[in-house]
């Protein structure tokens, strides 16, 4: 009786339950009922990354450099190539095609996480008690000034742009 | 239904070269290898070799390995198989044949060498 | 290259007793993959073999249920249970686990 199912790593084909390719191989030609199936390694910059059945391997990505790519890992038969983003640069998506510049947090805002090869720079208004005064990609917001630590006092309030301005204390007469 | 129609008798003398022709239908030929067997008068199987018409890999027998020259014709379905300095030896029936899903058979081509 | 021995040579039976024969290889041909590719053919006389049997025991499409095959290793047998007239011709076993693919000598079954 032809079976209608076949074993992990196996694929039905013209009633035969064939082997599929390993990965880094593609097939050449199917099992029959006097031969098993034949594969075939992937040529230079392909890969295939799992138990397959496919007659073509697929083309390892192309990190371009005119899009800001660069190879983080290098392929092999069995796994594609990984791209990163050059330094100051982050992936606009997870499949990497392309980078864009990190971007920087507008005064008033500072880093909450620094930037990577595949996320933006995260930024956060700078609460009370603290600004930032400069558009950074590295910059957190800094605290104000404590003028008492200094024997001084406030002489204009910080906001989230600005530091407080200390001066001294009046003197009494 | 499958078919595979072969070329006619061909009567060869010793030293020539003879190439048989193997015209498939009712399948998609770059699916399966064409395999070629012989049989000499009154004798048995002889396995001569194989080839994928997908890439045109071959697999042969090492006894003709140096004689025999197997290729495909995608274009009309069609797959050759040439046999070189031929030998009275060389005289019996060739067949080309193909399985998976079922096995089907050339009526056959008898080839006979003789001087 | 793998020498396939078949046995006998001719084979007299009588219509409708059973008939056997014998197939010994040089080598198993128990492939890695776990399956014997071990085949029967039949010839009638002045035709294109026909392929009763593949990997020991499968009967293709279209052939009686009186031919079975058996085996494994080296040591292969097909059966025909019950004889007709239409079962005369040669039986050759064949191999394709090993390259060069290899065939047996081939058994003459006539009638009695």
């Known amino acids: 009786e032809p079976p209608t199912a076949c074993r992990e790593k196996q694929y039905l084909i013209n009633s035969q339950c064939c082997s599929l390719c390993q990965p880094g191989q593609k097939l050449v030609s199917d099992c029959t009922e006097f031969t098993e199936t034949e594969c075939l390694p992937c040529g230079e910059s392909e890969f295939l990354d799992t138990w397959n059945r496919e007659t073509h391997c697929h083309q390892h990505k192309y990190c371009d450099p005119n899009l800001g790519l660069r190879v983080q890992q290098k392929g092999t038969s069995e796994t594609d190539t990984i791209c990163t983003c050059e330094e100051g640069w982050h992936c606009t998506s997870e499949a990497c095609e392309s980078c864009v510049l990190h971007r920087s947090c507008s005064p008033g805002f500072g880093v909450k996480q620094i930037a990577t090869g595949v996320s933006d720079t995260i930024c956060e208004p700078c609460p009370v008690g603290f600004f930032s005064n400069v558009s950074s990609a590295f910059e957190k917001c800094h605290p104000w000034t404590s003028c008492e630590t200094k024997d001084l006092v406030v002489q204009q309030a910080g906001t989230n742009k600005t530091d407080v301005v200390c001066g001294p204390q009046d003197r009494l007469r | 239904q499958v078919q595979l129609v072969q070329s006619g008798a061909e009567v060869k003398k010793p030293g020539a070269s003879v190439k048989v022709s193997c015209k498939a239908s009712g399948y998609t030929f770059i699916s399966y290898y064409i395999y070629w067997v012989r049989q000499a008068p009154g004798q048995g199987l002889e396995w001569i070799g194989g080839i994928n018409p997908r890439n045109g890999g071959t697999n042969f027998n090492e006894k003709f390995k140096s004689r025999a020259t197997l290729t495909v014709d995608t274009s009309i379905s069609t797959a050759y198989m040439e046999l070189s300095r031929l030998r009275s030896e060389d005289t019996a029936v060739y067949y080309c044949t193909r399985h998976g899903n079922g096995v089907y058979w050339g009526q056959g081509t008898t080839v006979t060498v003789s001087s | 290259d793998v020498v396939m021995t078949q046995s006998p040579l001719s084979l007299p039976v009588t219509l409708g007793d059973p008939a056997s024969i014998s197939c010994r290889s040089s080598?198993?041909?128990?492939?890695?993959?776990?399956?014997?590719?071990l085949h029967w053919y039949q010839q009638r006389p002045g035709q294109s073999p026909n392929h009763l049997i593949y990997?020991?025991?499968n009967r293709f499409s279209g052939v009686p249920d009186r031919f079975s095959g058996s085996g494994s290793g080296t040591d292969f047998t097909l059966k025909i249970s019950r004889v007709e007239a239409e079962d005369v011709g040669v039986y050759f076993c064949s191999q394709t686990t090993h390259v060069p693919w290899t065939f047996g000598g081939g058994t003459k079954l006539e009638i009695k």
């Open positions: 080598q198993s041909l128990l492939h890695s993959n776990g399956n014997t590719y």
């Open positions: 990997q020991v025991s």
